[in-house]
């Protein structure tokens, strides 16, 4: 969480941003909130990205003002116009690109004063893993697959019964480049698995951590997946 204050001339207002991560090819949110004003026409929101000549987005007098918008963001940004009056200056970023990563600044001007805060935005690819029993294999084998990751993650297997065991010798992980030549499909195979045990396939890079669990008993198979974004800090 980053909290910024405005200084010089007029009063300062508190602006708060939260560091976040975007999944390339999907839509993302750059979070920014501020002390609200009673008049929408008095609120100016300006989003900047460090190293970019134009603006990311500008909203003033109740509408978008995009004459100075940088080409790299053209047609890809929007504020939540109906929520600006209550202090939400968050920016929706469509079709997140790898190059959208960087430091952003959310500037706010209201009748009460002005303020700004920075936001670190990471980009990459992350997806839920699915763990299945590989019935084609000669021995009891589990197969963990996740369709889109970038940068290349690490894959670690764990088991409920053999806690702390190192499965690197009995697993094999491969990364297959997807058609867009950026993201990769992750496939990890775990051999010599035992019945009545819960296995976890943990995939992690510097943006996200995902876990796929599978519990195999003689009567049923239970699966569960979980994904967590890393380093979501407010400022």
């Amino acid at each position: 969480l980053i909290i910024g204050f405005g200084i010089s001339g007029r009063h300062s207002i508190t602006v708060t941003t939260v560091a976040s991560a975007g999944n390339i090819g999907e839509d993302g949110i750059l979070s920014c909130t501020f002390e609200p004003d009673i008049k929408l026409s008095d609120i100016v929101i300006q989003w900047l990205k460090e190293g970019v000549l134009g603006l990311v987005h500008e909203f003033k007098e109740g509408k978008d003002e995009l004459s100075e918008q940088d080409e790299m963001f053209r047609g890809r940004t929007a504020v939540f116009a109906d929520q600006v009056i209550v202090g939400n200056a968050s920016l929706r970023l469509k079709n997140v690109q790898l190059t959208d990563a960087g430091t952003y600044k959310c500037y706010i001007i209201t009748s009460k004063g002005k303020g700004n805060a920075n936001l670190e935005y990471k980009t990459g690819a992350f997806s839920m893993p699915e763990v299945n029993v590989d019935y084609n294999a000669s021995s009891e084998t589990l197969r963990c697959e996740a369709p889109r990751w970038f940068p290349q993650p690490t894959v670690v297997w764990a088991s409920q019964v053999d806690q702390g065991a190192n499965f690197s010798e009995v697993s094999n992980t491969s990364f297959e480049l997807n058609s867009e030549n950026v993201t990769m499909k992750v496939v990890s195979v775990l051999y010599n698995v035992t019945i009545n045990n819960t296995y976890s396939c943990m995939i992690e890079n510097d943006i996200a951590k995902a876990t796929g669990d599978i519990k195999v008993t003689e009567s049923e198979i239970k699966r569960r997946s979980h994904l967590q974004l890393l380093n979501s800090k407010a400022s």
Partner: antibody, heavy 117, light 107 residues
Framework: EVQLLESGGGLVQPGGSLRLSCAAS????????MSWVRQAPGKGLEWVSS????????YYADSVKGRFTISRDNSKNTLSLQMNSLRAEDTAVYYC??????????WGQGTLVTVSS | DIQLTQSPSTLSASVGDRVTITCRAS??????LAWYQQKAGKAPKLLIY???DLESGVPSRFSGSGSGIEFTLTISSLQPDDFATYYC?????????FGQGTKVEIK
């Protein structure tokens, strides 16, 4: 630490060509737009040209449009300015600048270009 | 093109003085104005961006204000290291323009 080092300046005859380079280090070069700004001897600053981080967008001052070309090689962290049809009024110290929040936050020490017969 | 006019062109002052430099734009540039300090034979150094934001590492005696057309750079208490030439610069559009400069010299 951000460092920008210009090179390629020198004496050239009117109508001649020169290529300036700016070697960048200490930051992720491809993420930052870059600019060239010049300063004639004893005079003020004059913006020459800018280029976006990926090199896809370029901008020029009217005084150099059609004669100068800005480019970058992100694999080598290098910014370039190709100057053709040089005139006496192009004589100046040429600075490369890294763009921060829309403006130049770090500048090199400059390279002198003298156009004279 | 947007023109910037700085005043005064030269300013004589003493250490400890409060110094104000004005920059006037030919049309509104919102808050897209920067201030630079340049010493003889050296590259310009960014002091203020977006009219009033202090660049990291710049002493707090420097401050900027204004929006639209009229802008000011203030040095609250002039130090020996502050004798230099100061330039305002607009970046409201993709083409930058600079003021003609203000030389701050020792009285």
């Amino acid at each position: 630490e951000v460092q920008l080092l210009e090179s390629g300046g020198g004496l050239v005859q009117p109508g001649g060509s020169l290529r300036l380079s700016c070697a960048a280090s200490g930051f992720t070069f491809s993420s930052y737009a870059m600019s060239w700004v010049r300063q004639a001897p004893g005079k003020g600053l004059e913006w020459v040209s800018s280029i976006s981080g990926n090199g896809g967008s370029t901008y020029y001052a009217d005084s150099v449009k059609g004669r100068f070309t800005i480019s970058r090689d992100n694999s080598k962290n290098t910014l370039s300015l190709q100057m053709n049809s040089l005139r006496a009024e192009d004589t100046a110290v040429y600075y490369c600048a890294k763009v921060g929040w829309r403006t130049g936050d770090y500048w090199g020490q400059g390279t002198l270009v003298t156009v004279s017969s | 093109d947007i023109q910037l006019t700085q005043s005064p062109s030269t300013l004589s002052a003493s250490v400890g003085d409060r110094v104000t430099i004005t920059c006037r734009a030919s049309q509104s540039i919102s808050s897209w104005l920067a201030w630079y300090q340049q010493k003889a034979g050296k590259a310009p150094k960014l002091l203020i961006y977006k009219a009033s934001d202090l660049e990291s590492g710049v002493p707090s005696r420097f401050s900027g204000s204004g929006s639209g057309i009229e802008f000011t750079l203030t040095i609250s208490s002039l130090q020996p290291d502050d004798f230099a030439t100061y330039y305002c610069q607009q970046y409201n559009s993709y083409s930058w323009t600079f003021g003609q400069g203000t030389k701050v010299e020792i009285k």
